[in-house]
Amino acid sequence: LPAQVAFTPYAPEPGSTCRLREYYDQTAQMCCSKCSPGQHAKVFCTKTSDTVCDSCEDSTYTQLWNWVPECLSCGSRCSSDQVETQACTREQNRICTCRPGWYCALSKQEGCRLCAPLRKCRPGFGVARPGTETSDVVCKPCAPGTFSNTTSSTDICRPHQICNVVAIPGNASMDAVCTSTSPTRSMAPGAVHLPQPVSTRSQHTQPTPEPSTAPSTSFLLPMGPSPPAEGSTGD
């Protein structure tokens, strides 16, 4: 004959454990039902009555089968530098992740505790390692033959255009200026040019008609008295 199915609460056989979704109540010394996700134990079981479960209140949750007396509080609302990627429900906590242009500088079990803006590389520097959800951008000086004239968390160093006749040689922060109407060729616009490992040498020293006209890192950028538009910190 098949063994009879025991209904909770029941006393377990010596040496055995309670079944799945049951827990052993030390006071009652019985196997009792757990509450499902989204619920909590309102009344604990006795020798004669099973656990009484109740739904979690607003802004509280339980994610697992449980016998906790109170549901867990959902985390605080996401800050302005975060987006809510998972809402607070009776069965799950709110999850906040960093909004685009930011990365997680201090993570927690789920989501992010502290977001920080991605580093922006200034002219003469390009993105050598892009930012991710959990790591900042790494900027590197543009190698000879490449330049970046922007302050950006995404722009890489791009190759100088090749001129028939050079009017102004390029440098780390400025493209070459050609005297002819069009360059003989320009590298593919999508080509990635990260700094190359080279032996120690002086940066940006290219043959130029007049070295004094091509300083090591010069810029052609618009002037203006207004603060930079990248954010309140200018960074």
């Epitope: 580093r119 200034r122 302050t151 010069s218 810029f219």
Partner: antibody, heavy 119, light 106 residues
Framework: QVQLVQSGAEVKKPGASVKVSCKAS????????IHWVRQAPGQGLEWMGW????????DYADKFKKRVTMTADTSISTAFMELSRLRSDDTAVYYC????????????WGQGTLVTVSS | DIQMTQSPSSLSASVGDRVTITCQGS??????LAWFQQKPGKAPKLLIY???SLQTGVPSRFSGSRSGTDFTLTISSLQPEDFATYFC????????FGGGTKLELK
């Protein structure tokens, strides 16, 4: 916390060379370039050059191009600045400073190394 | 090379005074100008970068501004710990420090 710790004071004869070290801690050494800046007694600050520890790329001020060599050893997170053919007017405090290539420039400095050139 | 002309070279002031130090670039340097504070026997300390941006931990009495190629560091109300030497630094076209301004107690 971020720290740049430099080697101790040096006394050198004219014509000799000096090598100053700058040990970095508290951040990823290869993610920042290291600048070297000097300051003669009672004078202003003078930029000498930078090194990218990752690749060894350098950029030197014209004034120092023929006499300075900047290197780095990533295994010990240390940058070095060697100045050769020393003259009495090279007597100065030499500083290292880090730079991440963002608009936030030279946000951490070493304590400085006094180099005295005297016969 | 771009030259940075800093003025005045020295300045006497009292606690509570409003003080301005000016740096003029010989060419356009966009907003790539920083201000450093240096006390005797110490390394320089970054106060302001990108012309306007206050470095973390620097008191809000320090501020930076710009008009064309003229850049200004303002200390709104001098505190005893502010007496030091201040340097501007351009990092747009190469790298160049201004000559410095020694701020002394009147």
């Amino acid at each position: 916390q971020v720290q740049l710790v430099q080697s101790g004071a040096e006394v050198k004869k004219p014509g000799a060379s000096v090598k100053v070290s700058c040990k970095a801690s508290g951040y990823t050494f290869t993610d920042y370039i290291i600048h070297w800046v000097r300051q003669a007694p009672g004078q202003g600050l003078e930029w000498m050059g930078w090194i990218d520890p990752d690749y060894g790329n350098t950029d030197y001020a014209d004034k120092f191009k023929k006499r300075v060599t900047m290197t780095a050893d990533t295994s010990i997170s240390t940058a070095f600045m060697e100045l050769s053919r020393l003259r009495s007017d090279d007597t100065a405090v030499y500083y290292c400073a880090r730079d991440d290539g963002s608009p936030l420039v030279m946000d951490a400095w070493g304590q400085g190394t006094l180099v005295t050139v005297s016969s | 090379d771009i030259q940075m002309t800093q003025s005045p070279s020295s300045l006497s002031a009292s606690v509570g005074d409003r003080v301005t130090i000016t740096c003029q670039g010989s060419q356009n340097i966009d907003n790539y100008l920083a201000w450093f504070q240096q006390k005797p026997g110490k390394a320089p300390k970054l106060l302001i970068y990108s012309t306007y941006s206050l470095q973390t931990g620097v008191p809000s009495r320090f501020s930076g501004s710009r008009s064309g190629t003229d850049f200004t560091l303002t200390i709104s109300s001098l505190q005893p710990e502010d007496f030091a030497t201040y340097f501007c630094f351009q990092y747009n076209n190469g790298y160049m420090f201004g000559g410095g301004t020694k701020l002394e107690l009147k």
